[in-house]
Interface confidence: medium
C-alpha cells in the first residue's frame, strides 16, 4: 500500500517531519533509513531505521486524587523491517504500572457560620444590590475540602432617588459628497459629517452632563487611484536536477508573476510560484555500522594456572562486541572490538554474607492484566575479600584496577526461613486500563 514519506523522524516526540510526498511504497521510502513514513495522514509515524523501543512516556496521572492509586506509562516499538527486543513487532505498546499517592488524605466538607449583616446599597440613586457574607468555619473543612453553597448572597435595594441622565453622541451621519471629483482645482475639495447629542439627551432635573467634543468634522477629499492590474503567471521553468544520490529526493519547477506584472495595487498571481516532484534514484543509502552491546566477560583466568578462584591472585578476562547493520558502503564502527581487564575470581567461593535493606517497591505486574501486584526483596549480599584494588602486572606499565568476577556462594543467617532471598508482595490499587494513546486521539 502507498504511504506518506517524510525526510526526518523526531525521536523526542515520535512525529514525522519534512513531508516528501505520498503515493510511494514503504520499501522505496525506506531506501534511506533516516526517513520515516505514515500509513495515513495524522496516523502513527514509523522511522525507517531498524526497530527499537521508544523512550517511556511520562507517567499518566494517578487514578485517584487522594489515598493510594495506580498509574500507567508506555513505550512503543518503532522502526521498520525487523523486531524490537522480546520479538515484538513495530507498533506494539509495552506498559508499566506503579503505585501512586497524590495526597495522603481525602477532602472533608466544612460547615457555614451564620450570615453577617447586610452591607450598604451598591448605588446612591435608582436601584442596586446589597450583599451579606458568611464564613466557612463551623466546622472548618479538612484536607482541601470546602463548604457547600456560596459565601455571599445579594438582593435588590432601592435608594428612592432619581438618577441624572448624561448626554451621549448618536452615530456620525454620512459624509457629504466632495465638491470636486479631482484634486488640484482652485478650491481644496472637502467633505463634512455631523452628529447629534441624542443617544440620549442630557436630563434637566436632575441635571445631566452634555456630550463631550464637537458636533461636526471636516476632511480633505482624496483623488481616485488609477485602475488596478492583476498579475498573471509566466510559463513554468525547467525542472531542477535530483538533489540526492540515494533514496528519494525532491525536484522543483519555478515560474514568475510577470505576464503581466501587477500594477496600481492589483492582486498578485494566485497559486504557487514553485511546484515539486519526487525523484527516485533507486539507489539504497549507506547505513553506518552500530556496535551491539558488549558480550559477557570471559572467565577470570591466569595463564599456566589451572584455577585462581577464591585466591588473592589477579587474572585477566575479556569481552567482545559485534559491528552490525553496515550496508551499502556505510562507515565501519569506531572503537575497539575487544575489552580486557584484570580480575579476582570469586566464582563459587563460599563468602560470609549480610542481609540487604528492603529494596524499593517494584513495578506492578502484569501492567495490562487483572490483579497486578508489586514486590520488594531483601537479598543475602556477599562481603567481598579485602584484596588490593590495584595491581602492577608488568614492570613500568603502572597500576591497573582489579575487579571481582564470578558468582560467589554467600552465607547469611536464616531470615524468615530463607537463606538467600526474602520477598514481600502487595496488590496494586485502583488500576486503570491500558489504552493505545493513538486511538484515544481519534
Amino acid at each position: 500500500d502507498p504511504v506518506l514519506c517524510f525526510t526526518q523522524y523526531e525521536e523526542s516526540s515520535g512525529k514525522c517531519k519534512g513531508l516528501l510526498g505520498g503515493g510511494v511504497s514503504v520499501e522505496d521510502c525506506c531506501l534511506n533509513t533516516a526517513f520515516a513514513y505514515q500509513k495515513r495522514s495524522g496516523g502513527l509515524c514509523q522511522p525507517c531505521r531498524s526497530p527499537r523501543w521508544s523512550l517511556w512516556s511520562t507517567w499518566a496521572p494517578c487514578s485517584v486524587t487522594c489515598s493510594e492509586g495506580s498509574q500507567l506509562r508506555y513505550r512503543r516499538c518503532v522502526g521498520w523491517n525487523g523486531q524490537c527486543s522480546g520479538k515484538v513487532a513495530p507498533g506494539t505498546l509495552e506498559w508499566q504500572l506503579q503505585a501512586c499517592e497524590d495526597q495522603q488524605c481525602c477532602p472533608e466538607m466544612g460547615g457555614w457560620s451564620g450570615w453577617g449583616p447586610w452591607e450598604p446599597c451598591s448605588v446612591t440613586c435608582s436601584k442596586g444590590t446589597r450583599t451579606r457574607r458568611r464564613a466557612c468555619n463551623h466546622p472548618a473543612p479538612k484536607c482541601g475540602g470546602h463548604c457547600p453553597g456560596q459565601a455571599q448572597e445579594s438582593e435588590a435595594c432601592d435608594t428612592q432617588q432619581v438618577c441624572p441622565t448624561h448626554g451621549a453622541w448618536a452615530t456620525w451621519g454620512p459624509w457629504t459628497p466632495c465638491s470636486a471629483s479631482c484634486h488640484g482645482g482652485p478650491h481644496e475639495p472637502k467633505e463634512t459629517r455631523s452628529r447629534k447629542c441624542s443617544a440620549p439627551e442630557p436630563s434637566q432635573k436632575p441635571p445631566g452632563k452634555p456630550c463631550p467634543g464637537l458636533a461636526y468634522e471636516q476632511r480633505r477629499c482624496t483623488g481616485l487611484p488609477p485602475c488596478p492590474v492583476a498579475g498573471g503567471w509566466g510559463p513554468w521553468g525547467p525542472v531542477s536536477p535530483c538533489p540526492v544520490t540515494c533514496g528519494l529526493g525532491q525536484t522543483m519547477e519555478q515560474r514568475t508573476c510577470n505576464h503581466p506584472v501587477p500594477q496600481h495595487g492589483g492582486p498578485f498571481c494566485a497559486g504557487d510560484a514553485t511546484r515539486t516532484h519526487i525523484c527516485n534514484t533507486a539507489v539504497p543509502c549507506p547505513v553506518d555500522g552500530e556496535w551491539d552491546s558488549w558480550g559477557e566477560w570471559s572467565p577470570c583466568i591466569r595463564r599456566n594456572m589451572k584455577s585462581i578462584s577464591c585466591q588473592e591472585i589477579p587474572g585477566q578476562q575479556s569481552r567482545g562486541r559485534t559491528c552490525r547493520g553496515r550496508k551499502f558502503d556505510g562507515h565501519r564502527c569506531a572503537g575497539q572490538q575487544q575489552d580486557i581487564r584484570h580480575c579476582y575470581s570469586i566464582q563459587h567461593c563460599p563468602l560470609k554474607g549480610s542481609w540487604s535493606e528492603w529494596s524499593t517497591w517494584g513495578l506492578c505486574m502484569p501492567p495490562c492484566g487483572p490483579n497486578p501486584t508489586r514486590a520488594r526483596q531483601r537479598l543475602c549480599t556477599p562481603l567481598l575479600p579485602k584484596y588490593p584494588p590495584t595491581v602492577s602486572m608488568v614492570e613500568g606499565q603502572g597500576e591497573k584496577n582489579v575487579t571481582f568476577w564470578g558468582r560467589p556462594l554467600p552465607r547469611c543467617e536464616e531470615l524468615q526461613g530463607q537463606k538467600l532471598v526474602v520477598e514481600e508482595k502487595r496488590p496494586c490499587l485502583h488500576v486503570p486500563a491500558c489504552k493505545d494513546p493513538e486511538e484515544e486521539e481519534l
Partner: nanobody, 129 residues
Framework: QVQLVESGGGLVQAGDSLRFSCAAS????????MGWFRQAPGKEREFVAA????????YYADSIAGRFTISRDNAKNRVYLQMNSLKPEDTADYSC??????????????????????WGQGTQVTVSS
C-alpha cells in the same frame, strides 16, 4: 486441559448475519486477551478481530471494519463474533485464540497469530451469492 470450542458456523446467503461463540475452559479466561482468525481455502490465516482481557479495547481488520463486532462475557467464559452484511469473500474456517501475556497492547501486537497461546479447532462459514 485447555479447550477452546467454537460454534455458530454454517451456510448463509450474502447480506445475512451470523453470531459465533467460543467457549473457553482449563485456564483463567478473565486474564486472557482473545482473538478471532480465519483461513479461506488455499489462502493464509488472516486476523479478524481481538479484545483485551477487560474488554476496554477492541481491534478489527480493515476488511471487516464496521460489519463485525467482537465482545466477551467473563462470567460465562465466552467470546463472541457478531457478523453482519456477510459477503461471499467472508467464506472461511473461523478460529478463536487466547493470549495471556498481559504486557503489550496495540493492533500491531494482536494481529499476529504467533502471540497467541491457545487455539480452537475452528468452525466453517459458507456465504453463497
Amino acid at each position: 486441559q485447555v479447550q477452546l470450542v467454537e460454534s455458530g458456523g454454517g451456510l448463509v446467503q450474502a447480506g445475512d448475519s451470523l453470531r459465533f461463540s467460543c467457549a473457553a475452559s482449563g485456564f483463567t479466561f478473565s486474564s486472557y486477551a482473545m482473538g478471532w482468525f480465519r483461513q479461506a481455502p488455499g489462502k493464509e490465516r488472516e486476523f479478524v478481530a481481538a479484545i483485551t482481557w477487560s474488554g476496554v479495547s477492541t481491534y478489527y481488520a480493515d476488511s471487516i471494519a464496521g460489519r463485525f463486532t467482537i465482545s466477551r462475557d467473563n462470567a460465562k467464559n465466552r467470546v463472541y463474533l457478531q457478523m453482519n452484511s456477510l459477503k461471499p469473500e467472508d467464506t472461511a474456517d473461523y478460529s478463536c485464540a487466547a493470549d495471556g501475556s498481559g504486557r503489550y497492547s496495540g493492533m500491531e501486537y494482536y494481529n499476529r497469530d504467533w502471540v497467541y497461546d491457545y487455539w480452537g479447532q475452528g468452525t466453517q462459514v459458507t456465504v453463497s451469492s
